[in-house]
């Protein structure tokens, strides 16, 4: 047994619809034959790393690094990636290995990096490390860039890791508010990577290419704005890099701004300070915090403090995974024939979403607002009064999401007949949905007040092409009325309509619309 | 668990006082700012004044020079005094650290 390798590393590529692939990192099901991916021993370095081969992965598929470890005795393990910490639950196999595994679902370029598995044996310790890369493949992909500061310079370099080669820009804007809309004067564009003028109000990067545009705003608390009732929320994933500029104005310089993360002072190196000069001679400092890839524990309340300023804060969520947090459950809504009216939906979400709304099988653009407390809404208006099933659905790199809404106009019903030469039926599809009601006219009553009771069956069906409810009556034709002309009607709150059919031997029947 | 309780709301004559205490538990209270909303009837919440760990206080400028804020870290507490008080002053009044906002008290200011 002596030859063996004590620790054995191996990839397994699971097919995308694998229903094999848990959540948990623990030990998901074998779904292709693992791949060696020989772990040796590397040289030089300090303590017993293992290498294992570098692991070229395409993007959305899902794998499982999996190490068997040949010790005797309990082991216990840690993984490591991207200075982030994630559980680890070694279990053995059949021939008593300790195994343990990693399991990447739908890899993106977030997932992309070295993984560090750290284990501990009754008899020694190792490090395991895993390079894990997207394939360059064909697939255009435009990713939201992200910033990085340039180095030596206070200046920012806006990052897209996008195939073709994206076409970045910085969009700025120095007034308040709605004058900041893409197409306002207010807004310069600058067609290039690196950014030195930082004092704006608002500084947006984006990046485009043949698949569309992606832009991120650089989060800003002003403290010379009035706090917010709410506080803003920043949610990045790990992994990503954090960028928030804190800015404050004064009539002259004697005033200093620092960043506290749950009343600490944010350490040297994840923060630096510019000040200028405005026009008016008042000065303008900004400070920024960053760190350059995200882990759990740098969740919590960033706070900038200034001596001549009411400190403000922001809430900074760290997330494993991205999400789409709304209501689904499907909503009906009934307006009149010309009443104004728009579906919305309020979601949060990151990173920020794609979405569609669509009505009989056609898609609508879809347009996304910010709101001041973290939530976004979509809003949609152009059903042009058109009744049925309307569907939201949005998606991000990690999560979907579909709500339905079902749109009902208030109108008066209006009655179509048809006929056979056993029975007469009548269709409408007003709303609120109509009762009916069978009259037949003769001699006795010539105004087709005889009401009709036998025979009558009603029904409502959807309308499956709109989702829209159509209610029909029939009547079944009995000796009683062959001959007469009779009269179905249709109401309720809004108006009646009738139409008037004369049932005699088979063949055309004459229908007299009647309102 | 954070918990914030305001007191001392009530109903007052134009020109009148009150001192209006927020008083904190579930957080390091000496290491956080606090500051004052209000609310009035139809209208948004609006800040009214902070106070920092340091000590430091801002207004609005629509209370400057009526109002004074300021903490006692000993019992958890700051206190909002409200001098010169205007009809306009009428409303519910929040005290907040951080995402954390007490019930509110009710400050009524009759001419």
């Known amino acids: 047994n002596q030859d063996l390798p004590v620790i054995k590393c191996v990839l397994i590529n699971h097919k995308n619809n694998d229903s094999s692939v848990g959540k948990s990192s623990s030990y998901p099901m074998v779904s292709e034959s693992p791949e060696d991916l020989g772990c040796a021993l590397r040289p030089q370095s300090s303590g017993t790393v293992y290498e294992a081969a570098a692991v070229e992965v395409d993007v959305s598929a899902s794998i499982t690094l999996q190490v068997l470890v040949d010790a005797p005795g309990n082991i216990s393990c840690l993984w490591v990636f991207k200075h982030s910490s994630l559980n680890c639950q070694p279990h053995f196999d059949l021939q008593n290995r300790g195994v343990v595994s990693m399991v990447i679902l739908k890899m993106t370029e977030t997932q992309a990096g070295e993984y560090l598995l750290f284990i501990q044996s009754e008899a020694t310790n190792y490090t395991i490390l895993f390079t894990v890369s997207i394939r360059n493949t064909l697939l255009y992909t435009l990713r939201r860039p992200y910033f990085r500061k340039m180095e030596n310079q206070d200046a920012l370099v806006c990052i897209s890791e996008s195939v073709p080669e994206p076409i970045v820009e910085w969009v700025l804007c120095d007034s308040q508010g709605e004058s900041c809309k893409e197409e306002s004067p207010a807004v310069v564009k600058k067609e290039e990577k690196v950014l030195h003028e930082l004092f704006g109000t608002d500084i947006r990067c984006c990046a485009r290419n043949e698949l569309g545009r992606e832009c991120t705003r650089l989060f800003t608390i002003d403290l010379n704005q009035t706090p917010q009732t709410t506080l803003p929320q920043l949610f990045l994933k790990v992994g990503e890099p954090l960028w928030i500029r804190c800015k404050a104005v004064h009539v002259n310089h004697g005033f200093g701004l620092t960043w506290e993360l749950e009343n600490k002072a944010l350490e040297e190196g994840n923060y630096f300070e510019m000040s200028t000069y405005s026009t008016n001679r008042t000065m303008i400092r900004i400070l920024f915090a960053f760190v350059s890839s995200v882990a759990r524990n740098d969740t919590g309340y960033y706070t900038c403090s200034s001596s001549k300023h009411p400190s403000q804060s922001a809430l900074v969520t760290i997330v494993e995974k991205g999400f789409i947090n709304a209501t689904n459950s499907s909503e009906d809504y009934e307006i009149d024939q010309y009443e104004e009216f728009c579906f919305s939906v309020r979601f949060k979400a990151y990173p920020q979403i794609r979405c569609t709304w669509t009505f009989s099988r056609k898609s609508f653009p879809c347009e996304q607002k910010g709101l001041d407390n973290g939530y976004s809404i979509s809003k949609f208006c152009n059903h042009k009064h058109q009744p049925g099933e309307y569907i939201f659905h949005a998606e991000n790199d990690d999560a979907q999401f579909t709500k339905m809404f079902t749109l009902n106009i208030r109108r008066k019903p209006q009655v179509l007949a048809e006929a056979s030469a056993s029975q007469a039926s009548c269709f409408s599809d007003g709303y609120p949905l109509p009762s009916w009601t069978w009259k037949k006219c003769s001699d006795k009553s010539p105004n087709c007040t005889e009401e009709i009771t036998e025979g009558v069956w009603n029904r409502k069906a959807n309308r499956k092409v709109f989702g829209q409810w159509v209610s029909s009556s029939t009547l079944n034709m009995s000796e009683a009325i062959k001959g007469f002309l009779v009269k179905c009607c249709a109401y309720n709150s809004l108006g009646t309509s009738c139409e008037t059919i004369l049932l005699n031997s088979p063949g055309p029947f004459p229908f007299i619309q009647d309102n | 668990q954070v918990q914030l309780q305001e007191s001392g709301g009530g109903l007052v004559q134009a020109g009148g006082s009150l001192r209006l205490s927020c008083a904190a538990s579930?957080?390091?209270?000496?290491?956080?700012?606090i500051d004052w909303y209000r609310q009035a009837p139809g209208n948004e919440r609006e800040w009214v004044a902070q106070?920092?760990?340091?000590?430091?206080?801002f207004y609005a400028d629509s209370v400057k020079g009526r109002f004074a804020i300021s903490r006692d870290n000993a019992k958890n507490t700051v206190y909002l005094q409200m001098n010169s008080l205007k009809p306009e002053d009428t409303a519910v009044y929040y005290c907040?650290?951080?995402?954390?906002w007490g019930q509110g008290t009710q400050v009524t200011v009759s001419s």
């Open positions: 907040r650290v951080l995402s954390y």
């Open positions: 579930g957080v390091t209270f000496s290491a956080s700012y």
């Open positions: 106070i920092t760990r340091g000590g430091d206080s």
